[in-house]
Amino acid sequence: YDFTNCDFEKIKAAYLSTISKDLITYMSGTKSTEFNNTVSCSNRPHCLTEIQSLTFNPTAGCASLAKEMFAMKTKAALAIWCPGYSETQINATQAMKKARKSKVTTNKCLEQVSQLQGLWRRFNRPLLKQQ
């Protein structure tokens, strides 16, 4: 999906109002310095591409993020403010259904959510030069 035509300011507002709080809740008990940010993004569409990938695509050691509250609200925001987004996700969701049976918070998932927090922070500051 090409995120170029999304309403970035509304997605940012939804993130700041509620999605960010759900990410913090997920990470509660984890030190903010515990994980190094290794995933980066260069502009808002790129950030949303990376956010979608980390949130909804199962990875080795962390197959369960798509069932978390922050993922549900992220999907809602992208569907509402990115034209045509919901129509593009059907195949991806079917492929993930087997991987999402159990919800287990592993260290790998905590690391992945830490990366997500970094991507969202970068999304919110699009004018900053890439480090």
């Epitope: 709080k21 809602a76 969701t93």
Partner: antibody
Framework: QVQLVQSGAEVKKPGSSVKVSCKAS????????MNWVRQAPGQGLEWMGQ????????NYNGKFKGRVTITADKSTSTAYMELSSLRSEDTAVYYC??????????????WGQGTTVTVSS | EIVMTQSPATLSVSPGERATLSCSVS???????LHWYQQKPGQSPRPWIY???TLASGIPARFSGSGSGTEFTLTISSLQSEDFAVYYC?????????FGGGTKVEIK
């Protein structure tokens, strides 16, 4: 304007199933989570589950132990809630409720009128 | 699951008086995830307050919401006849979504 119109009242026998529909209009049906909430007579509200019509993803309240199935038909903008192995305690009003961002806070912003399901032998 | 406990179950108030409804949450949640709904007999619930303190469209200013963590409050500064109803709090912090048992505000 957003409207959620539910199917009519049902009377069912214990052990049978019921399927309640919720027809949505006035918004992009595929892009909003749809929730199902029930209310037994004189009781509070109980969340049963939700579906994202765009891709069919669902989340359920584990209390219902596989008795509830939520589906959606994008072609008719209709969500369905099917409850099986009915017992008398399932007698309730069943509501569909859209999940949406209001002032960028996420909540159930529009509700159907409710469908009364009576389970009686 | 997060348990929502509302008190009192019934609140008897005279018109013009102040009413304070409490919602206690079993584990701390973000204020953005606590909502209130109003329900009158024979009607569907209506969104009333979003995210602890944001009034839904058309809700009069005599209503207010506050709180954080595990304790939240809905206050009606001066009750009018149309305010007599049941009010439910609800969390959208974790699955399963849960509601409080409701507080019925009735005429004294």
């Amino acid at each position: 304007q957003v409207q959620l119109v539910q199917s009519g009242a049902e009377v069912k026998k214990p052990g049978s199933s019921v399927k309640v529909s919720c027809k949505a209009s006035g918004y992009a049906f595929s892009s909003y989570w749809m929730n199902w909430v029930r209310q037994a007579p004189g009781q509070g509200l109980e969340w049963m589950g939700q579906i994202f019509p765009g891709d069919g993803e669902t989340n359920y309240n584990g209390k219902f132990k596989g008795r509830v199935t939520i589906t959606a038909d994008k072609s008719t903008s209709t969500a369905y809630m099917e409850l099986s192995s009915l017992r008398s305690e399932d007698t309730a009003v069943y509501y569909c409720a859209r999940g949406g961002y209001v002032n960028f806070l996420y909540a159930m912003d529009y509700w159907g009128q409710g469908t009364t399901v009576t389970v009686s032998s | 699951e997060i348990v929502m406990t509302q008190s009192p179950a019934t609140l008897s108030v005279s018109p013009g008086e102040r009413a304070t409804l409490s919602c206690s949450v079993s584990s701390s949640i973000s204020s953005s995830n606590l909502h209130w709904y109003q329900q009158k007999p024979g009607q569907s619930p209506r969104p009333w307050i979003y995210g602890t303190s944001t009034l839904a469209s058309g809700i009069p200013a005599r209503f207010s919401g506050s709180g954080s963590g595990t304790e939240f409050t809905l206050t009606i500064s001066s009750l009018q006849s149309e305010d007599f109803a049941v009010y439910y709090c609800q969390q959208w912090s974790s699955y399963p979504l849960t509601f409080g048992g409701g507080t019925k505000v009735e005429i004294k």
